[in-house]
């Protein structure tokens, strides 16, 4: 028979032969032959392989370095790497989460559109007309201007995106 030129899923071609890949959590010890199956070996503690593979070495679990603001979100297994996230108030600088930076605060005139998570920074938005923010904060949204009318007061000073309106008593008309 003709030697194969392509192999099925979870197989690989070697020496004109299709061999089974090693399952996640195991590494390759020796390729299959005409007479023997692929020989695989489990990864040890602190190691993993997360795909069907023909790797001869397992990978080391990632270290979530507290000096970089990292902590373990989920311990690794023989089939998965450690998942790192950031300490409270910090977020990852990349998808791989290799280091963390402090959450950004929204300046006065801007409010928090989306609060930061361990993996994403704060998203700020300018306070639209009718809203204000007078603080620098990673949590505060834009607040609506005070409604003077509902308090039977009048606007004495107009609000801005950084300040609330100032209400005052209505002028009494004298007869």
């Amino acid at each position: 028979p003709e030697p194969p030129t392509a192999c099925r899923e979870k197989q690989y071609l070697i020496n004109s032969q299709c061999c089974s890949l090693c399952q996640p959590g195991q590494k390759l010890v020796s390729d299959c032959t005409e007479f023997t199956e692929t020989e695989c070996l489990p990864c040890g503690e602190s190691e993993f392989l997360d795909t069907w593979n023909r790797e001869t070495h397992c990978h080391q679990h990632k270290y979530c370095d507290p000096n970089l603001g990292l902590r373990v979100q989920q311990k690794g297994t023989s089939e998965t790497d450690t998942i790192c996230t950031c300490e409270e108030g910090w977020h990852c600088t990349s998808e791989a989460c290799e280091s963390c930076v402090l959450h950004r605060s929204c300046s006065p005139g801007f409010g928090v559109k989306q609060i930061a998570t361990g993996v994403s920074d704060t998203i700020c938005e300018p306070c639209p007309v009718g809203f204000f923010s007078n603080v620098s904060s990673a949590f505060e949204k834009c607040h609506p201007w005070t409604s003077c009318e509902t308090k039977d007061l009048v606007v004495q000073q107009a609000g801005t995106n950084k300040t609330d309106v100032v209400c005052g008593p209505q002028d009494r008309l004298r007869a």
């Epitope: 070996l41 040890g44 503690e45 602190s46 190691e47 397992c58 270290y63 902590r71 311990k75």
Partner: antibody
Framework: QVQLVQSGAEVKKPGASVKVSCTAS????????VHWVKQAPGQGLEWMGR????????KYAPKFQGKATMTADTSTSTVYMELSSLRSEDTAVYYC???????????WGQGTLVTVSS | DIQMTQSPSSLSASVGDRVTITCSAS?????MLWFQQKPGKAPKLLIY???NLASGVPSRFSGSGSGTDFTLTISSLQPEDFATYYC?????????FGGGTKVEIK
């Protein structure tokens, strides 16, 4: 300071039990597996078992199944190893140690000497 | 259980000597760990994942091997290297140590 601190030396009578503690400071014990290792006087190292402090999952060497019980209290970052029905051959230094990451290389406690004597 | 046979059990050597310690596993393991222990002290990890030096370990230490046969080499023995050395496999439960090799001054 990053370390594992074990409880002090114990002298026990045959048949009694002893509970050795191992407390982590400067790191989160839940991020590691904690192993217990026995070293009898003048002898080599013997792996007893390991516990995952996060969920309490434990594995024991057959020789220590029924002899040792490992538990964890993550609120105090402490792992315990209790030895029951003590005999003279349980006299040894017991060490706790963690799994390693490339960056920490595993931590070891200072060891706890347990002496079993009538 | 995987049996770990370490040899020699003891050796005498002089400062500057090249020292080789072997560890043979009864079945293939993924990697070997090597520890150094000095009297009255806790063991210290020297080599992880068969051939990688732990932080702060001098480059005169090296590890090699695969499958069932592993080696720890000290290229030029120093006075502070006189100690007992242990191999350990952490692939199959129960994890097991070798019997140890005591390196003494000749």
């Amino acid at each position: 300071q990053v370390q594992l601190v074990q409880s002090g030396a114990e002298v026990k009578k045959p048949g009694a039990s002893v509970k050795v503690s191992c407390t982590a400071s400067g790191f989160n014990i839940k991020d590691y597996y904690v192993h217990w290792v026995k070293q009898a006087p003048g002898q080599g190292l013997e792996w007893m078992g390991r516990i995952d402090p996060e969920d309490g999952d434990s594995k024991y060497a057959p020789k220590f199944q029924g002899k040792a019980t490992m538990t964890a209290d993550t609120s105090t970052s402490t792992v315990y190893m209790e030895l029951s029905s003590l005999r003279s051959e349980d006299t040894a230094v017991y060490y706790c140690t963690t799994s390693y990451y490339v960056g920490t290389y595993g931590y070891w406690g200072q060891g706890t000497l347990v002496t079993v004597s009538s | 259980d995987i049996q770990m046979t370490q040899s020699p059990s003891s050796l005498s050597a002089s400062v500057g000597d090249r020292v080789t310690i072997t560890c043979s596993a009864s079945s293939s393991v993924s990697y070997m760990l090597w520890f150094q222990q000095k009297p009255g002290k806790a063991p210290k990890l020297l080599i992880y994942s068969t051939s990688n030096l732990a932080s702060g370990v001098p480059s005169r230490f090296s590890g090699s091997g695969s499958g069932t046969d592993f080696t720890l080499t000290i290229s030029s023995l120093q006075p502070e290297d006189f100690a007992t050395y242990y191999c350990q496999q952490r692939t199959f439960y129960p994890y097991t140590f070798g019997g140890g090799t005591k390196v003494e001054i000749k």
